[in-house]
Structures are given as C-alpha cells and as structure tokens.
Interface confidence: low
C-alpha cells in the first residue's frame, strides 16, 4: 500500500524526505525562515500528513506563505517611511520611524529601523518589539536668538518664536468678590507641564498659609507674542497645580511650581519647550549672561502702588526681554541685607542684575525662566525662575532681581512630571 | 540603588583621634552632600556637619567646630569624618546619611552606623 | 538652635490603636519637619518630610500633620513592627544646625 511520492511546497520541506511512502508512514510539512504554512486559511508551523491504508494521503500538501508583519504601529510624533518597493511588510522588509524634526527627537538616538522578522514581528536592534519615544526637543528656539544683546526694565520687544518655551499663566479666581485676577510667567518644558515659581499659583490670601489656586481658575497662553491679539496663541487649561510643599510665603524660599496642562500642546515654531539643567548645587556661574522674557511691567518710572491700582493694564503689549548678568552670591546677599527689612537670600536662589541698574525683570514677569546658553549641548537651559525683588522700583540702582535657583530642584521636577531623570537628562550634559 | 558602607566600630583611647568612612554607591557621588549625625546612647541625634563632594563644600554645627573634620576620597566615592582629642562624651554612633532630594534637608538614606567607644 | 521638643519620652499602645506622637518646635519652622522611625541597633528610617507628605515606601497609617511649630505623627491601626523609637526633626535652620526631637518610644501595654 504505497502512497504517491509528495512534492515539498516552494519555500518549504518534507521530513523525513524518502523514495517510497507506505501505510502509516508520516512526514512533517514544514516552511523555510519567513515563511509560515498555509491550509485552509489558516497559518501554522508545521502540518503532519499520513499514508493511509488505501494509498492515499491524509491530506493536500499545504502551502508556505511569506510572513508578514502588517501595517506597523503608528508613533506618537513620529513618521513611518517604507525601505522597501511598494511599501512591503512582509519577511525582511524593512521600516524606518523617525521623529517630527525639528520639533521631536528619538530617545536615545535609536536608528528607528525595524525589519519585519520570521516571528511576523517588527524588530529593532536595540528596542526589540518595542516603539521608539519620540520626545520633545527642548532649548532650541526656531529662530535663533541673538548672541549680544546690548547692554521687563530697559528690555527690548522679542521676535515671536524667539522664546518659544514662554507661557503666559493668567489667574482669575471668580468665587471672590470683587474678582481676583493676576499673571504670571512660566516655562514649557515638555507638552504637558509648565514651570514658574511658587508665588504666581499661591491663593492670595491674608495670612501666611500656602495653598494652590483652584486649577479652574488658570489658563496658561503658549506661542503667544502680543497679548491684544491671542488669536494664534494655543491656550489651555491647567489639569494640576504643583507647588513646593517647602514654599515660604515669607521669605520665598522655594518658589517654584508646576503646572500640569489639560492637554498636552502641539508643538511648532512658536511652541517648544527649554531645557532643565543638571542637577547642580552651584547653579550658574556669577557673570554668566542670561536672557529673561514677560509681559511685565516695561517702564521704570511705574510705581508699586500704581501697578497694584492699575491690576493688569500694566502688561507690555508685546513680550520684551533683557540680558542680565549672574550676581555673585554674596554680593546680592551683601546689597540686601544692607536694606532695612527682612531679606533672606537663600541657597536656593541667585541673583542677576546690573550694579548700576536700568535693566531688570518686574512684576508680571514672575515665574519666568531666565536662560542660559550651554555651549556644549548647543541648547537654552532654563536656570532661574522671576521670584522677587527688594522694595524700590524695578532696575533701582543695586537692586538685584533674585531668581529661584533651579537646577536644586531637578530631581523634584522630574519626580512631579513622572519621568525618569535619565531620559532627557543626556541633553544638556557638560 | 542608594546604598552607604560605614566602617566597622573603633575602641579609642581619651585625647586620641579616629577616623571613620562612608562609601557612597548607587548614585552621582558629587550630586549630593553626606551629612553625619552623632547618636549617643540611648540617646537623641545631633547633626554635625555635611561634606558636598561637588565643590568640597563642608558645613558643620557649631557645636562640633573643632571636633570635627569632613574630607573626601573621590576615586572611592567615600567621605570620611574624624574626631579629634576624644573624650568619652564622643562614644557613640555616627551615622552618615543622604538626601533624598537636593534640596530638602531631611535623610532618607543612612549608613548602618559606626561605633565609637572612648575609653582608657 | 531651635529646639524641638518631644515631651513623652515613652508612649504605650496595643496593636490596632490609634496613636498620636508630638513635637513641639522653639520657633517657627514652617512646614519644614520630617519624622523618623528607630528601632534598636538601626539606623534611623524616614517617614514623613515636610510635615505631612509620606516618604515613597512608606505604610499609609503613619501621617503627618501641623505647620508654624506644633507637629503630629499619627499612627493609625498600630501593628507590631510599629513599636520603635520616633524623633522628628526641623530643617527650617539649615545651614545652622539640624535638629532633631528627644525621640518617643512606642512601647505595648
């Protein structure tokens, strides 16, 4: 009882592979690397035939089927480009995702290429199965900013994308009569949080308490350049408030917050986040030069008490910004507590000013980043955050703006925004 | 993970000195300050004094001015603390500890403990 | 230095109670006080830092609670492992000196 000789599938094999095939004898169909068998529509391993009594086999020989891993996953921020012709999936091909440049980068370098492997999965070198990250590209305004500013107070107007980290934070606290409604600065650092200081998101209250604002009575303004017209501006609402547990109404000690975006923004040319620093317990070096931006306050000659009165019609139309320099610490800690009056320049602060004053940030300008050129990584490092400044006008003579020292609070900010430190943290190495 | 290697315990005799380490692992040696807390027995904590291996910044209480002296071995990763002209008022443990956050003064991170006995 | 203050050297409690360990600054410290557990022949572990925010790892029935310069750990449901040694401490001074609470001892009935 001899069963037909039996042809192995193209792509495939029959073992064991002999002359002649009698009653009960079994082979095993089985398909090369990157092939799966096919029968009856349905893809497996191996298919096992017998020679039956009569001659006969038990089954057709199925056929091998190239693998194929289908349309590949879809990147957050990403793109998908096909290596190979006509856009193939199957065994072999090849994919490469990449980032939405200049605005996303890929985590770690990766290549971003994946080949469709035997298993009928898409593979990378290093990820294995898994997607790349495409992550925000942070410090890297759109237009470039400029190098020497000659030697906010005596500022000049900003090119819109010029400072595309900086994010108008507007309260307004309705449940109060008559309505409460003040601003502040803050610094996009990925597409979902903000950075500012402690004092601009704290309830305005009587005593000495901390407690956040309500979320629902902050809008925070990104990509925005003249606030007459926010039409282009992305506007969003505020889905957390963070501020430091350890904020010190009295002495500012601690002034900084976060702000957790509804949704996370569309970045572009006008919307980018600045880079964190490395976690450095000296923070920037005295006469290192930083640039700082807001709608504050840009006329030396506006008292406090008419800034008080007036509430927010003291905004600069147009987003100015100043280049000021890193005060030593105990120069600024000498010219404060030569003024009557409580001033505690602490270690998580530094100062930035000229001696001779003219130049400083104000009020409205709070919570904004003052940042610093790092050469080696080519990126704008967000350093400081607008705190506070001593009682006389802004850009008073020997009046140092001082500003919360930020890279002492890297650890806690990534510890908020849940990410691990490692993951941006190569950006901005020395 | 964060983890500090204290040196084993010392028997000294009044008016000597003895040096004891902390071997910091797990982390950026330079990113944070060791600090170093006195336990006498039975007793409260008292802070003596922080090394930052960052900049070799010391600070120190006070009341350990002089008693006290922080240097550091940065290719071991370890900070040392020595006492000088011992009496038996300095028996005792001498934790060192870490912050948890740069800029938060408390120690989530401690060192098993180095004991000190003073005695003739 | 600030002093703090912690007036019951020894408290006694059975498990499942509900136990309330306090501290008492000198001055005006904020919110900047953190507590520790101790038991015999450790190291101090921490449990709350800034007053009232519990360190990662940290069982939920240890809170914290108290601002300017009156403190509490409240122990709810006390299990046996409880039964240690708790100081608290202030960092409202730093860089002058640290300091920490005499320490309360958790003890049974």
């Known amino acids: 009882n001899e069963c037909p000789e039996l042809q192995p599938p193209v792509h495939g094999k029959i073992e064991p592979s002999q002359a002649k095939y009698f009653f009960k004898d079994q082979v095993l169909v089985s398909c090369d690397t990157g092939y799966k068998v096919l029968k009856d529509n349905v893809e497996m391993d191996t298919f096992q035939i017998e020679c039956l009594k009569d001659g006969t086999w038990s089954n057709k020989i199925p056929t091998c089927k190239i693998v194929d891993c289908r349309a590949p996953g879809e990147l957050e921020h990403g793109l998908i480009t096909f290596s190979t012709r006509n856009n193939l999936t199957t065994y072999k091909s090849e994919i490469k995702y990449s980032c939405q440049e200049p605005y996303y980068k890929m985590l770690n370098n990766n290549t971003g290429i994946y080949t469709c492997s035997a298993q009928g999965v898409w593979m990378n070198k290093v990820l294995g199965r898994s997607l790349p990250t495409c992550l925000p590209e942070c410090g890297q305004p759109s237009r470039s900013l400029p190098s020497l500013v000659k030697r906010i107070i005596g500022g000049r107007n900003a090119e819109p994308g010029l400072f595309p980290w900086q994010a108008l934070i507007v309260v307004e606290d309705t449940s109060r009569v008559p309505n409460d409604k003040w601003f502040g600065s803050g610094a996009l650092l990925s597409a979902s949080w903000i950075l500012t200081a402690a004092h601009v998101l704290r309830s305005q209250r009587r005593d000495t308490t901390v407690i956040p604002v309500s979320k629902e009575h902050v809008t925070v303004y990104l990509g925005l350049h003249d606030v007459r017209d926010k039409s282009g501006a992305v506007n969003s609402s505020a889905a957390r408030v963070v501020l430091h547990p350890d904020f010190n109404i009295q002495n500012y000690n601690h002034d900084i917050a976060l702000v957790q975006l509804q949704e996370p923004v569309p970045l572009g040319p006008h919307v980018m986040p600045v880079c964190l620093p490395r976690l450095e317990p000296e923070g920037p070096a005295p006469h290192m030069l930083g640039l700082v931006a807001g709608w504050g306050i840009s006329n030396p000659n506006v008292t406090v008490d008419e800034i008080i009165s007036s509430g927010t019609r003291t905004l600069s139309d147009v987003l100015q910004y100043v280049k000021l320099p890193v005060v030593p610490h105990a120069e600024c800690k000498t010219s404060y507590e030569s003024r009557s009056g409580n001033y505690s320049v602490t270690e998580n602060m530094f100062c930035a000013g000229y001696y001779e004053g003219g130049k400083d940030t104000c009020l409205g300008d709070s919570g904004g980043a003052f940042v610093i050129f790092d050469d080696l990584s080519q990126r704008w490092v967000v350093q400081g955050l607008v705190s506070w400044g001593g009682p006389e006008e802004c850009g008073s003579k020997q009046v140092y703006g001082v500003y919360t020292k930020v890279s002492n609070y890297v650890d806690w900010v990534w510890e908020q925004m849940g990410l691990p430190q490692s993951v941006v943290e190569p950006q901005v190495e020395r | 993970q964060v983890q500090l290697k204290q040196s084993g315990a010392e028997l000294v005799t009044p008016g000597a000195s003895v040096k004891m380490s902390c071997k910091a692992s797990?982390?950026?040696?330079?990113?944070?300050?060791i600090e170093w807390m006195k336990q006498n027995h039975g007793k409260s904590l008292e802070w003596i004094g922080n090394?930052?291996?960052?900049?070799?910044?010391?600070k120190y209480n006070e009341k350990f001015k002089g008693k006290a002296t922080l240097t550091v071995e940065k290719s071991s990763n370890t900070v040392y603390l020595e006492l000088s002209r011992l009496t038996s008022d300095d028996s005792a443990v001498y934790f060192c500890?870490?912050?948890?956050?740069?800029?938060?003064?408390?120690?989530?991170?401690w060192g098993h403990g180095t004991l000190v006995t003073v005695s003739s | 230095d600030i002093v703090m203050t912690q007036s019951q050297k020894f408290m006694s409690t059975s498990v499942g109670d509900r136990v309330n360990v306090t501290c008492k600054a000198s001055?005006?410290?904020?919110?900047?006080v953190a507590w520790y557990q101790q038991k015999p022949g450790q190291s101090p572990k921490a449990l709350i830092y800034?007053?009232?925010y519990r360190y990662s790892g940290v069982p939920d029935r240890f809170t914290g609670s108290g601002s300017g310069t009156d403190f509490t750990l409240t122990i709810s449901n006390v299990q046996s492992e409880d039964l240690a040694e708790y100081f608290c401490?202030?960092?409202?001074?730093?860089?002058?000196?640290?300091?920490f609470g005499a320490g309360t001892k958790l003890e049974l009935k």
């Open positions: 500890a870490r912050r948890v956050y740069y800029s938060y003064f408390w120690f989530g991170y």
């Open positions: 797990g982390y950026t040696f330079t990113t944070y300050p």
């Open positions: 090394f930052h291996p960052y900049n070799d910044d010391t």
């Open positions: 001055q005006n410290v904020g919110t900047h």
């Open positions: 800034s007053a009232s």
């Open positions: 401490q202030q960092y409202n001074s730093y860089p002058r000196a640290l300091t």
